[in-house]
């Protein structure tokens, strides 16, 4: 069961795995969540009744029963990992800790104007995990405004002490805010010959790369495939580092693959979620349970639902045995990876999917794949919603996109004449408008947030947020789309689609089935030539065919212009305005979402 609240003056007895130092109980809970085995923790806050050497200790704990005896202790704060919870988790920590010195290896010292500049420097330095900044009030003159970049083996401080007039904080790499280059390629027949910081077993190079990405010290990796000549090294994933942050040498070796940590990538990428099945492969590890299961998919579900299970091996049933049910071996290890991987024994193996929620929900796989559009299939655009008004009668008003479990992004112009959010209904997971009946469940709207600079669609700022009265439970048919990252401003999207129930020609009616049309983006210079009477700003983005024929139209407003990049869908535009529909040399004009990411975050994260 999911327990999010922290238990004050409470200590969990026993079950210790390891002790780390964290600046707050909240961050201790995050560290516990990301640790492969931690289910509970006890944090010691600063207190006169506590020995200062125990301040800021975060003891990570495990228990077969998922709980431990509680003992009263002043200054102790205990709690449970978020592994048991279904909500999305993030390692991103933007907090700045005042008067705390987070200890680590000080490998870089320089002058900075502010703590923010120091944090940016840490975020843009390949080795930096956290920093301490001496403010201009720091007593020692020669240390004022000094920014110390630090790293440790674990990514967390080796100790934390009180120190007046300093501030500390963490790198924002996990917030996708780094400017470091991101090399996504995996290089076949390549070995990187640099120092190994760790090694784990992995079924393929992709899992190896993901493990490297969330390992605090790993900058790049080498994976030896199952065809690697040296048997003892098959399926070995070597996690590596170097002083420069890049491999010093690449050696050509058959049956090995190498690649980079994606910790600095500014795009949303799944890192924790290993969703594939590995056939004729057995994962070895500590056995948690053996259960009968109908299929390997059912076995994966069992593993996902058992909070301590990290991976599994399923052995299919022999002919008519056990009502056709096979054996599902639920397993775990100290680091979350199999201790050995064997091939040729007929098992089917895989990993728990409970870590998928640690990735942004918007990155998880969508089913493979509007004037001139074609009908969509169910679950193809799970972020698309239909926004209805109930006044004077109920009808489709606009499209919109799920961007969070309580948030819909849409166009401001949809709310002309809408006096109150009470008359709005948001329907998600809908393919056909005819599915919407009296008793169809919907989300009420608690608040309409229109950009305060919005006047009319053609002059920009055509963006609005709807805060829902209740939260959306993500399923295959209703889930969020990723916002583009500010680091993606230079990305050239080539796979963009506009979707909606809008008109198929200028004089038409709302369509029953959700329509889709693939539309190329047009440069703003080109778009400006087509709309001489308007100012096409950088806060707008245009899309359309020169010859026309495919476009958004009335009723599509507020809906998404969705573009796929690196296998992840991004909400690049919001359908805003255009001259007619699908006219020759008149592209559709969309709100350029990347330019409003800060506005969106400010509004959705406001307490």
């Amino acid at each position: 069961e999911c327990v999010t609240q922290l238990l004050k003056d409470t200590c969990f007895e026993g079950g210790d795995i390891t002790t780390v130092f964290t600046p707050s109980a909240k961050y201790c809970q995050v560290v516990c969540t990301y640790h492969p085995r931690c289910l509970l923790f006890t944090f010691t806050a600063e207190s006169p009744s506590e020995d200062p050497t125990r301040w800021f200790t975060c003891v990570l704990k495990d228990s077969v029963t998922e709980t431990l005896p509680r003992v009263n202790r002043t200054a102790a704060i205990s709690g449970y990992s978020f592994k048991q919870c279904s909500h999305q988790i993030s390692a991103c920590n933007k907090d700045i800790y005042v008067d705390l010195d987070m200890k680590g290896i000080n490998y870089n010292s320089s002058v900075a104007k502010s703590a923010q500049e120091c944090q940016e420097r840490c975020t843009d330095d390949v080795h930096c995990h956290f920093f301490t900044y001496a403010t201009r009030q720091f007593p020692s003159l020669e240390h004022r405004n000094i920014c110390l970049l630090k790293h440790t083996q674990t990514g967390t401080p080796t100790r934390i002490t009180k120190l007046d007039k300093v501030v500390s904080g963490f790198s924002l790499k996990s917030c996708a805010l780094s400017n470091l280059a991101c090399i996504r390629d995996i290089f076949p027949n390549t070995v990187f010959a640099d120092s190994n910081i760790d090694s784990v077993m992995a079924p393929d190079a992709f899992v190896c790369g993901r493990i490297c990405t969330h390992h605090p010290g790993c900058l790049f990796f080498t994976f030896f495939s199952q065809e690697w000549p040296k048997e003892s090294q098959r399926n070995l994933c070597l996690l590596k580092t170097s002083e420069s942050g890049l491999p010093s040498t690449r050696i050509k070796k058959s049956k090995a693959l190498s690649g980079f940590s994606l910790q600095s990538c500014r795009h949303s990428i799944p890192v924790f979620c290993h969703s594939s099945f590995y056939h004729d492969t057995d994962f070895l590890g500590e056995e948690l349970d053996i259960v009968a299961a109908k299929s390997h998919e059912a076995c994966q579900k069992l593993c996902t639902n058992a909070v301590r299970c990290q991976f599994f091996t399923y052995t299919p049933a022999q002919a008519s045995c056990n009502e056709g049910k096979g054996k599902c071996y639920l397993k775990l290890s100290s680091n979350g990876s199999p201790t050995k991987i064997l091939h040729g024994r007929g098992g089917i193996s895989g990993y728990t999917l409970r870590l998928c929620k640690m990735d942004n929900e918007c990155t998880t796989k969508i089913k493979p794949r509007i004037v001139g559009g074609t009908a969509s299939v169910r679950g193809e655009w799970p972020w698309q919603v239909t926004l209805h008004t109930t006044s004077p009668t109920q009808r489709h008003l606009c499209g919109g996109s799920i961007i969070g479990n309580q948030w819909i992004l849409t166009a401001a112009h949809c709310f002309y004449g809408v006096e109150s959010p009470k008359i709005l209904r948001v329907y998600s997971g809908i393919l056909n408008q005819s599915e919407i009946k009296e008793d169809t469940s919907f989300f009420g709207v608690q608040e309409i947030i229109i950009h305060d600079q919005y006047k009319m669609a053609e002059s920009g700022y055509d963006i609005a947020l709807l805060k829902l009265e209740t939260t959306v439970n993500y399923t295959d048919s209703q889930r969020p789309i990723c916002l583009p990252s500010k680091g993606d401003r230079n990305v050239i999207y080539t796979d963009c689609w506009v979707t909606g129930w809008g008109y198929r020609k200028l004089r038409d009616k709302i369509q029953n089935t959700l329509q889709k049309a693939k539309i190329p983006l047009v440069t703003n210079e080109e778009c400006q030539k087509r709309y001489r009477g308007h100012k096409i700003t950088h806060k707008m983005i245009c899309a359309g065919y020169r010859e026309g024929g495919k476009d958004a139209c009335k009723g599509d407003s507020g809906g998404p212009l969705s573009c796929k990049h690196n296998e992840v869908w991004h909400l690049v535009g919001i359908t805003s305005w255009g001259e007619g529909c699908a006219q020759r040399e008149r592209p559709g004009v969309y709100t350029n979402v990347v330019e409003y990411v800060d506005w969106i975050l400010e509004k959705t994260q406001a307490v």
Epitope: D124, D125, V126, L180, S244, G245, L246
Partner: nanobody, 122 residues
Framework: QVQLVESGGGSVQAGGSLRLSCAAS????????MAWFRQAPGKEREGVAL????????SYTDSVKGRFTISQDNSKNTVYLQMNSLRAEDTAVYYC???????????????WGQGTLVTVSS
């Protein structure tokens, strides 16, 4: 200290090509990465292409992928930027930079050239 000197800029018609060179001298073995940045009038400086000096790893910004090629000649301590299919929007002052981080952030580079102007007319 590292000195960087760019050359090869000039005017060219859209669709044409240019090759920029950046010669490095001084304490060059401290450089982990070299990069080409550009700055168009009234715009921020943006990264175009990066190269890791020891291992040769390369990264391009999306808008130049398939048109620009960064390369290096270690014997001459020189990095090149071959620019093909040039467009009007490529008009900018192009800077060569050297630093220890393989990064798109100008702040990660300690050494800069004086810049060379590339003008593409349509």
């Amino acid at each position: 200290q590292v000195q960087l000197v760019e050359s090869g800029g000039g005017s060219v018609q859209a669709g044409g090509s240019l090759r920029l060179s950046c010669a490095a001298s001084g304490y060059t073995y401290s450089m982990g990465a070299m990069a080409w940045f550009r700055q168009a009038p009234g715009k921020e400086r943006e990264g175009v292409a990066l190269i890791a000096t020891s291992s040769g790893f390369i990264s391009y910004t999306d808008s130049v992928k398939g048109r620009f090629t960064i390369s290096q000649d270690n014997s001459k301590n020189t990095v090149y930027l071959q620019m093909n299919s040039l467009r009007a929007e490529d008009t900018a002052v192009y800077y060569c930079a050297a630093g220890t981080q393989f990064s798109w952030s100008p702040g990660s580079y300690n050494y800069w050239g004086q810049g060379t102007l590339v003008t593409v007319s349509s």
